[in-house]
């Protein structure tokens, strides 16, 4: 029980300094201080996707 409680402790009790190095399909989310799955940005004029080009997000459909 104790070990489990440590593993799921509140996010605010953990160090929030340097962003973690994430793998290629992930990026660092400052809100949760961890790597999460990330989608690619999409440049509207070219239609290309890139993790470096900000623009309208490429999504299969609208949000609910």
């Amino acid at each position: 029980m104790g070990a489990r409680r440590l593993r799921v402790r509140s996010q605010r009790s953990r160090d929030s300094s340097v962003p973690t190095q994430c793998n290629q399909t992930e990026c660092f989310d400052p809100l949760v201080r961890n790597c999460v799955s990330c989608e690619l940005f999409h440049t509207p004029d070219t239609g290309h996707t890139s993790s470096l080009e900000p623009g309208t997000a490429l999504q299969p459909q609208e949000g609910s």
Epitope: R12, R14, C22, P30, L31, V32, V36, F41, S51, G63
Partner: antibody, heavy 125, light 107 residues
């Protein structure tokens, strides 16, 4: 199609407990953070808690800390909000939502893109 | 916790008007601000993320700007379906916090 469906709301007496469920389809919850947000009648949005199922990290609003517990079962693709010691001021529509992230130079640029329909929790004697 | 202060709390406008809603964070949140639209009895909808990026399917009359502590949502030409309540939210530091909302009503 991405979808979030909440269930488990209802009428409960002060001091009572409820467990809300948020069943996800069309995506895997382990890849994102899942949030509970509530809205009291006629009031604004109040964030309640989040869970990052891949690692089990959690955080809570001060107003619910010690009373509510957020969790997730990745095998069922479902998130939960266990609510204990309920108070009249917990009366609200409870929504679950997914936080989407877009990769902007290795950092998340995102927001809550998919929301459930909401489930009403009424705490009254 | 970071406070998000929205203004005005409500406004009356006509179809075709340009509408501006502001949100001020109590500390620097970089560009980690999203804007949502909510209609009565419905779940919120994401409009803008990362302060200025338009979410998929959202009409281009919506735009966002700002960084640090001051943020703006602009509707360039208000349409009948835009009468709703709008919320800002910061997600730079947990806990994520919402503004109190701005209700846009028909004049």
């Amino acid at each position: 199609e991405v979808q979030l469906v909440e269930s488990g709301g209802g009428l409960v007496q002060p001091g009572g407990s409820l467990r809300l469920s948020c069943a996800a389809s069309g995506f895997t919850i382990s890849a994102s953070s899942i949030h509970w947000v509530r809205q009291a009648p006629g009031k604004g949005l109040e964030w309640v808690a989040w869970v990052l199922p891949s690692v089990g990290f959690t955080d809570y609003a001060d107003s619910v800390k010690g009373r509510f517990t957020i969790s997730a079962d990745t095998s069922k693709n479902t998130a939960y909000l266990q609510m204990n010691s309920l108070r009249a001021e917990d009366t609200a529509v409870y929504y679950c939502a997914r936080r989407v992230c877009y990769n902007r130079l290795g950092v998340c640029a995102g927001g809550m893109d998919y929301w459930g329909q909401g489930t009403l929790v009424t705490v009254s004697s | 916790d970071i406070q998000m202060t929205q203004s005005p709390s409500s406004l009356s406008a006509s179809v075709g008007d340009r509408v501006t809603i502001t949100c001020r964070a109590s500390q620097d949140v970089s560009t980690a601000v999203a804007w949502y639209q909510q209609k009565p009895g419905k779940a919120p909808k994401l409009l803008i993320y990362s302060a200025s990026f338009l979410y998929s399917g959202v009409p281009s009359r919506f735009s966002g700007s700002g960084s640090g502590t001051d943020f703006t949502l602009t509707i360039s030409s208000l349409q009948p379906e835009d009468f709703a309540t709008y919320y800002c939210q910061q997600s730079q530091i947990s806990p994520p916090t919402f503004g109190q909302g701005t209700k846009v009503e028909i004049k």
